[in-house]
Interface confidence: medium
């Protein structure tokens, strides 16, 4: 960052999107600012308009190509600059040498579905979205289940230390409404972080058979 009150953070979704957030104390809300991306060895550059997301932070997405196109690799370096208009000229407010595969945040898993549900267990599957083929199987997942009367923050995390796009939830209560979420993270990258949580999948366990203990 150009000065100490400025923070410029970007993540690569591993395919064709770099999402950036820039925050600066005391910056004017109505200033027009952009993120400029200049790769070190690619024949394109890209710009996105920073839009306010809070009082002192702005965000934008650099769309590098079609969603599943592999636009960057582990050896790329992309110079990212925040440029803000000052009268007739542009001023550089922040800069970073962005190494995409050191700063990964994948898209949230999609297509969650109940494969099989019983009284005490439920098998759920999902798919990863726009994830690079470079990862092969080097991904991990976290999942959580929302029980009645609890919050998501209280839900214990279940960790899947391999690329496993399903889970069998056990010890559930019969005839009970639950919600389920999952997120994904590549093993690669010093600053890599978890994807956003998936959209919650609601499901209900089967009622216990009459006359049987639960």
């Amino acid at each position: 960052a150009v000065n100490g009150t400025s923070r410029f953070t970007c993540f690569y979704n591993s395919r064709a999107n770099i999402s950036c957030v820039w925050s600066q104390d005391g910056a004017l809300q109505d200033t027009s600012c952009q993120v400029h991306a200049w790769p070190d060895r690619r024949r394109w550059n890209q710009t996105c308009e920073l839009l306010p997301v809070s009082q002192a932070s702005w965000a934008c997405n650099l769309i590098l190509g079609t969603p599943d196109s592999q636009k960057l690799t582990a050896v790329d370096i992309v110079t990212l600059r925040v440029m803000c208009r000052e009268g007739v000229r542009w001023r550089m407010m922040a800069i970073q040498d962005f190494k995409p595969f050191e700063n990964l945040r994948l898209m949230a898993p999609i297509s969650l579905q109940v494969v099989h549900v019983e009284t005490h267990r439920c098998n759920i599957s999902w798919k990863i979205s726009q994830a690079s083929h470079y990862f092969e199987r080097h991904l991990e997942f976290e999942a959580r289940t929302l029980s009645p009367g609890h919050t998501w923050e209280e839900a214990p995390l279940m960790t899947l230390k391999q690329k496993q796009e399903w889970i069998c939830l056990e010890t559930l209560t019969p005839d009970t409404q639950y919600e389920f979420q999952v997120r994904v993270k590549p093993l690669q990258g010093e600053f890599t972080t978890w994807s956003p949580w998936s959209q919650p999948l609601a499901f209900r366990t089967k009622p216990a058979a009459l006359g049987k203990d639960t």
Partner: antibody, heavy 119, light 106 residues
């Protein structure tokens, strides 16, 4: 006009250290990556490393740990700090910058500075 | 590292001759760069992105190729073309150069 001017070369004993400078003019070192390349007498070109616009560095594994690239933005100058020098480090050292886009190749070169490592 | 192998290592040709230099990469590269270095001088960029002529470079110089095989051509050799020519890849780090081809006049 873009210009690069190296200095700081000379004779140094094996195991010694030397710091080369590359004074840039006609552009800001915070806007372009600048690279160091060397050429041993009668030999080909060897890329040593680069310092990118944002200040991060990249090195050839052959010199990583012994050579350090840095810059002084206020002086618009790049540096190559060379430690634990060996006879095989004897070469002309160039700084170079790509064209307007990095992938344009090394469009701008300094005149080079000779480093001789010998006892 | 990607190894760049130039051939020939030296050649002698007459003024007006067509001169061709090849550069073989040890693995596929996206684009190739070619430089001219006259004795005692810094290298000069001639070709970037495989086939694009750098600013101020005469049109007798050209480049082509893809994958692992690239070619540099001087369509009509001139006395001022006496120099060593280098190929270079910028597909992966470390950046690497060919060992050079020395061009002389017969």
């Amino acid at each position: 006009e873009v210009q690069l001017l190296e200095s700081g070369g000379g004779l140094v004993q094996p195991g010694g250290s030397l710091r080369l400078s590359c004074a840039a003019s006609g552009f800001s070192v915070t806007s372009y990556g600048v690279h160091w390349i060397r050429q041993a007498p009668g030999k080909g070109l060897e890329w040593l490393g680069a310092i990118w616009s944002g200040g991060s560095t990249q090195y050839n594994a052959a010199v990583k740990g012994r050579f350090t690239i840095s810059r002084d933005n206020s002086k618009n100058t790049l540096y190559l700090q060379m430690n634990s020098l060996r006879a095989e480090d004897t070469a002309v050292y160039y700084c170079a910058r790509a064209g307007d886009a990095n992938y344009d190749g090394f469009a701008y070169w300094g005149q080079g500075t000779l480093v001789t490592v010998s006892s | 590292d990607i190894q760049m192998t130039q051939s020939p290592s030296s050649l002698s040709a007459s003024v007006g001759d067509r001169v061709t230099i090849t550069c073989q990469a040890s693995s596929s590269v996206s684009f190739m760069y070619w430089y001219q270095q006259r004795p005692g001088k810094a290298p000069r960029l001639l070709i970037y992105d495989t086939s694009n002529l750098a600013s101020g470079v005469p049109s007798r110089f050209s480049g082509s190729g893809s994958g692992t095989s690239y070619t540099f051509t001087i369509s009509s050799l001139q006395p001022e073309d006496i120099a060593t020519y280098y190929c270079q890849q910028w597909s992966t780090y470390p950046l690497t150069f060919g060992q050079g081809t020395k061009v002389e006049i017969k």
